[in-house]
């Protein structure tokens, strides 16, 4: 004969665990149903009645199967330096990421708590390491023979042009200036 399927709530066999999408209620001492994502427990189970679930209210969510009595609050609205990459729904929290030109200075479990503008390297300095979603730009002084004449978070130090005859020598923040004879790189 096939084993009889137990309907929640039921007392688990000694040493066994509750099934998928169930939890062991320590007060009722029964395996009871969890609530689906987007819901929360409105009434906990008893020995004879299963969990009663209810939908999360606006601006709250549950992402997992659960038996929490209250849904989690969605995070606050994204700030002006952020972009909402995932909206707040009953099943997921809002995710804010930094807009272009900014990086995440203080991250949270998902998305970013605090964005900061990417550092701009001033003339005479170029980008040694580009910024990422979570790290700032690293600048370095332009080495002899190279220059950067911009204030930029993306420009690297470029080589001076090579002149047949130099009118003005280049430096870290300025390219060389050649006389009218055509320069070479």
């Amino acid at each position: 004969l096939p084993a009889q399927v137990a309907f929640t709530p039921y007392a688990p066999e000694p040493g066994s665990t509750c099934r998928l999408r169930e939890y062991y209620d320590q007060t009722a001492q029964m395996c009871c149903s969890k609530c689906s994502p987007g819901q929360h427990a409105k009434v906990f189970c008893t020995k004879t009645s299963d969990t009663v679930c209810d939908s999360c209210e606006d601006s709250t969510y549950t992402q997992l199967w659960n038996w929490v009595p209250e849904c989690l609050s969605c995070g606050s609205r994204c700030s002006s330096d952020q972009v909402e990459t995932q909206a707040c729904t009953r099943e997921q929290n809002r995710i804010c990421t930094c807009r272009p030109g900014w990086y995440c200075a203080l991250s949270k479990q998902e998305g970013c708590r605090l964005c900061a503008p990417l550092r701009k390297c001033r003339p005479g300095f170029g980008v040694a390491r580009p910024g990422t979603e979570t790290s700032d730009v690293v600048c370095k002084p332009c080495a002899p023979g190279t220059f950067s004449n911009t204030t930029s978070s993306t420009d690297i130090c470029r080589p001076h042009q090579i002149c047949n005859v130099v009118a003005i020598p280049g430096n870290a923040s300025m390219d060389a200036v050649c006389t009218s004879t055509s320069p070479t790189r």
Epitope: Q26, T27, A28, A41, K42, V43, F44, T46, K47, T48, S49, V52, P69, E70
Partner: antibody, heavy 119, light 106 residues
Framework: QVTLKESGPGILQPSQTLSLTCSFS??????????VGWIRQPSGKGLEWLAH???????YYNPALKSRLTISKDTSKNHVFLKIANADTADTATYYC???????????WGTGTTVTVSS | DIQMTQSPSSLSASLGDKVTITCKAS??????IAWYQHKPGEGPRLLIH???TLQPGIPSRFSGSGSGSDYSFSINNLEPEDIASYYC????????FGGGTKLEIK
């Protein structure tokens, strides 16, 4: 408006059965998720949970007192009863009944009834 | 059974002070803790449930926090009507009260 009121014998002798009644209004024990529990407080001491009954008649007892406690309800009259067998002087206390929510905390309490067990 | 250790058992504070009471559970209670105010001749009054959810009508001076087995309850800007005893209640596994804290004015 939810209200609960406890009543009891006032005074009784050791070894007798202590009988308490909780009369409530503003909610029904026919309603899903509703429950009523009993809590006591001996004079000068803290609160102690005794027993609880749910809308579906499921019952829970304090393990230390379980053998002496019986909780029951009369849903039609909005009454919950608690009996404590073999009363002792240590059972002298103020007894409270309280409504319990579906997520298991007491949200509204009665003002209590004082019971003295003395010979 | 879960034991709840509440401290301090008594507390003397001045009006306007912030006071904090703690409850430690003998095991993880998954945020299932409530806090009650109890005045003589009255039934206890629910202030907070599920660790930090303020009951409707309760002033925001009252707050709760914690997780696992460690929980705290605070009253900001103490007022004369706050003089009472305070109890925590764990409802993660059956129901157990803390021993209570009697709050007095200096």
């Amino acid at each position: 408006q939810v209200t609960l009121k406890e009543s009891g014998p006032g005074i009784l002798q050791p070894s007798q059965t202590l009988s308490l009644t909780c009369s409530f209004s503003g909610f029904s024990l026919n309603t899903l998720g509703m429950g009523v529990g009993w809590i006591r407080q001996p004079s000068g001491k803290g609160l102690e949970w005794l027993a609880h009954i749910w809308w579906d008649a499921d019952k829970y007892y304090n393990p230390a007192l379980k053998s002496r406690l019986t909780i029951s309800k009369d849903t039609s009259k909005n009454h919950v009863f608690l009996k404590i067998a073999n009363a002792d002087t240590a059972d002298t206390a103020t007894y409270y009944c309280a409504r319990m929510t579906g997520t298991r905390y007491f949200d509204v309490w009665g003002t209590g009834t004082t019971v003295t067990v003395s010979s | 059974d879960i034991q709840m250790t509440q401290s301090p058992s008594s507390l003397s504070a001045s009006l306007g002070d912030k006071v904090t009471i703690t409850c430690k559970a003998s095991q993880n209670i998954n945020k299932f803790i409530a806090w009650y105010q109890h005045k003589p001749g009255e039934g206890p009054r629910l202030l907070i449930h599920y660790t930090s959810t303020l009951q409707p009508g309760i002033p925001s001076r009252f707050s709760g926090s914690g997780s696992g087995s460690d929980y705290s309850f605070s009253i900001n800007n103490l007022e004369p009507e706050d003089i009472a005893s305070y109890y925590c209640l764990q409802y993660g596994v059956l129901w157990t009260f803390g021993g209570g804290t009697k709050l007095e004015i200096k």
